[in-house]
Interface confidence: low
Amino acid sequence: VPRWRQQWSGPGTTKRFPETVLARCVKYTEIHPEMRHVDCQSVWDAFKGAFISKHPCNITEEDYQPLMKLGTQTVPCNKILLWSRIKDLAHQFTQVQRDMFTLEDTLLGYLADDLTWCGEFNTSKINYQSCPDWRKDCSNNPVSVFWKTVSRRFAEAACDVVHVMLNGSRSKIFDKNSTFGSVEVHNLQPEKVQTLEAWVIHGGREDSRDLCQDPTIKELESIISKRNIQFSCKNIYRPDKFLQCVKNPEDSSCTSEI
């Protein structure tokens, strides 16, 4: 008789999840010499231990502590780029500007980027059929808790000037419910972080509005100021040109506003 299985509202664990995590770990440690000491099998075991045999609506940050310990990594605290709803451009930027880092440029962020995972209570099975949706099912699911944990640690590590890339095409350029708005903003350390600089990325070619005056950006400024951190904002009117100018800063067209 087939055992009854909980049907969740979200997509199931990413196909070939264990192989993906392990292979990404191997690849990352090859690319980053400072992480060569990492034992990827132990990393996978710790990752698996965080959610296997546990109810997928009852995951805690504590479950991920063994993985956090193994994935401990020092990134230059003044070279951190946060992002909200504009991951692809943020990643393209750090691919070019190699001395800056998004969360997904760290080992733990890299391992989990674009993946979904969950287990089942009291069995060692990975659930490939469905996983809890953050809104429809529960917020304490394996994926949400993982990103909340690593995002908090990443923000806590930041210092000096922290940059954040925001999507100017969205109705809420700054969204209090995003990971950036609900976790990272509140875990920047005022004694270490001097300024949060927002880069608002424009979508339309002819869009010349000053999106730094958007009400949600003003809301972000208010939250940050109350935390005794300075706030600055820049419009990136031409994201394509912005990337080109990061690659070729000596280009004569890069002196004008982008």
Epitope: T14, K15, R16, E19, T20, L22, A23, R24, V26, K27, I31, K87, D88, H91, Q92, Q95, V96, E104, Y110, D113, D114, L115, L243
Partner: antibody, heavy 124, light 108 residues
Framework: QVQLKESGPALVKPTQTLTLTCTFS??????????VGWIRQPPGKALEWLAL???????RYSTSLKTRLTISKDTSKNQVVLTMTNMDPVDTATYYC????????????????WGQGTLVTVSS | DIVLTQSPATLSLSPGERATLSCRAS???????LAWYQQKPGQAPRLLIY???SRATGVPARFSGSGSGTDFTLTISSLEPEDFAVYYC?????????FGQGTKVEIK
Amino acid sequence: QVQLKESGPALVKPTQTLTLTCTFSGFSLSSDGMGVGWIRQPPGKALEWLALIDWDDDKRYSTSLKTRLTISKDTSKNQVVLTMTNMDPVDTATYYCARFNWFYRLAFVNPDVWGQGTLVTVSS
Amino acid sequence: DIVLTQSPATLSLSPGERATLSCRASQSVSSSYLAWYQQKPGQAPRLLIYGASSRATGVPARFSGSGSGTDFTLTISSLEPEDFAVYYCQQGYNSPFTFGQGTKVEIK
């Protein structure tokens, strides 16, 4: 270095089954993150992705051709075999095999090394 | 299936000129999974760009890729004689992994 070579019949009759073999060296299909796929190109036309087999025997196929395609691997021989049933003159093309490898940040990937291709003509 | 539409179909330029090739996806593709290939007559395609913007090994710096979501661009900053060829974009985001129909860069 990584090399792939396609082999199979140059001429196939309509309704027959085509069997193509990709023999490769310089990597192992039992290694995590490796895959071998097939892509074809009719004369003067664009590339068309056909099928992919991964190190863990996971198989994926073109939507329009999946009922006619079967991909398999023999890891010990470093070979991947593609069979395509019910061949038609419109299937005349150069058939390429290619390695699919892992890159920075990726779970699903793009072919990075290709064989030189083999021209298959379908005619009675 | 994700459909990739490349434009223009043909680009007629002179050596030394800048070439801009476009690839538009029918649905959003993570930039991590977008690649560009170069194909010369009688040869197999050669990987130029992966992850939308990363040059493959041995690819000259005059080739660059950019874009995200549904719009991607391959730029050749200054065409060399050996760059005249057909260029294809390809997505590895959703199976089946589709190709664009190609852009031919020809000598004017």
